[in-house]
């Protein structure tokens, strides 16, 4: 009596159970009463990641440099390519289908968290006593110079964008 269900890693065809092709291989011809399933390895830039009866392998993902992408991990006959962003860029989605340039923090703001391949720069306003005079994706807010420790006095107050200006103390005449 012909089977109605097959074991794991098998499939039912023409009333008989045939072996599935292993990951990394595609189906060329189904088994018969006298022959085994015929499978063939996937070619260059192709993969299949499961036991299968596919007649065509899937194409590896292309990491398009025009979208800021590069290969992080080459695909194999059993795995897809993994893309990541070039340095200075980060993915726009979890699937990392394209990248955008890391945001820079404007003067008056410092970097709270440096961007990664998957997250953008996080900026924070420089609090009183700190400043940032550059637009940067790396620079934190810097503390104002302490004039007192240099035996100087503040000649011009600092802001969130500028450092204090120190000067000599007035001499007593």
């Amino acid at each position: 009596e012909p089977p109605t269900a097959c074991r794991e890693k098998q499939y039912l065809i023409n009333s008989q159970c045939c072996s599935l092709c292993q990951p990394g291989q595609k189906l060329v011809s189904d088994c018969t009463e006298f022959t085994e399933t015929e499978c063939l390895p996937c070619g260059e830039s192709e993969f299949l990641d499961t036991w299968n009866r596919e007649t065509h392998c899937h194409q590896h993902k292309y990491c398009d440099p025009n979208l800021g992408l590069r290969v992080q991990q080459k695909g194999t006959s059993e795995t897809d390519t993994i893309c990541t962003c070039e340095e200075g860029w980060h993915c726009t989605s979890e699937a990392c289908e394209s990248c955008v340039l890391h945001r820079s923090c404007s003067p008056g703001f410092g970097v709270k968290q440096i961007a990664t391949g998957v997250s953008d720069t996080i900026c924070e306003p420089c609090p009183v006593g700190f400043f940032s005079n550059v637009s940067s994706a790396f620079e934190k807010c810097h503390p104002w110079t302490s004039c007192e420790t240099k035996d100087l006095v503040v000649q011009q107050a600092g802001t969130n964008k500028t450092d204090v200006v120190c000067g000599p103390q007035d001499r007593l005449r």
Partner: antibody
Framework: QSLEESGGRLVTPGGSLTLTCTVS????????MGWVRQGPGKGLEWIGT??????TDYANWAKGRFTISKTSSTTVDLKMTSLTTEDTATYFC???????????????WGQGTLVTVSS | AFELTQTPASVEAGVGGTVTIKCQAS??????LAWYQQKSGQPPKLLIS???KLASGVPSRFKGSGSGTEFTLTISDLECADAATYYC???????????FGGGTEVVVK
């Protein structure tokens, strides 16, 4: 399509040197490039690769002392610092098979330029 | 660290004969292996990529095979022009893994 390396010469230990690879008939905006060296009587040694985006990757031993950069639409430079006698070799530039990957095979090579590090 | 071991270092065979060169990777590199031929005083020339894909203009006497960690280059019907040093190269991933084998000198008698 051709590649030509230049800039190889005698340099003293501790010195620096920049080699230039000039390409003809090759579009550096669509081709990755690499540098490979070969010591006298020795085998081939990968130095690093530059992708079309100008992103670079280096062999672990080359990190910090070797820098690859695209200097024009037809030239790629290899800057070498803190040179030692072990860096004496013929330096080849070569076209990589991929434009978005650091790890490539090379399907077109220049003739090479000789760098000798000696006091 | 990743290593690519090529054997033998040197091999000799007569015209019309066959030589086999082996390349062993210390970890799986799928099929990301290339073979080059280098004649004295010349740059290397690509023969084979992705284990078995012949480069343009390379005769079918050159045959690459293998996958994972074990690879072979077979040259059949040897000609005098095949006298050269042959290198394998992994181009998988990791800063160490884009390395070349030590080379095999083929001497044709």
């Amino acid at each position: 399509q051709s590649l030509e390396e230049s800039g190889g010469r005698l340099v003293t230990p501790g010195g620096s040197l920049t080699l230039t690879c000039t390409v003809s008939g090759i579009d550096l905006s669509t081709n990755g490039m690499g540098w490979v060296r070969q010591g006298p009587g020795k085998g081939l040694e990968w130095i690093g690769t530059i992708r079309v985006t100008a992103g670079t990757d280096y062999a672990n031993w080359a990190k910090g002392r070797f820098t690859i950069s695209k200097t024009s639409s037809t030239t790629v430079d290899l800057k070498m610092t803190s040179l030692t006698t072990e860096d004496t070799a013929t330096y080849f530039c070569a076209r990589g098979h991929a434009n978005n990957d650091a790890y490539v095979y090379f399907n077109l090579w220049g003739q090479g330029t000789l760098v000798t590090v000696s006091s | 660290a990743f290593e690519l071991t090529q054997t033998p270092a040197s091999v000799e065979a007569g015209v019309g004969g066959t030589v086999t060169i082996k390349c062993q990777a210390s970890q799986s590199i799928d099929r990301y292996l290339a073979w080059y031929q280098q004649k004295s005083g010349q740059p290397p020339k690509l023969l084979i990529s992705y284990t078995s894909k012949l480069a343009s203009g390379v005769p079918s006497r050159f045959k690459g095979s293998g996958s994972g960690t074990e690879f072979t280059l077979t040259i059949s019907d040897l000609e005098c022009a095949d006298a050269a040093t042959y290198y394998c190269q992994s181009y998988f991933t990791s800063d160490d893994a884009n390395s070349f084998g030590g080379g095999t000198e083929v001497v044709v008698k």
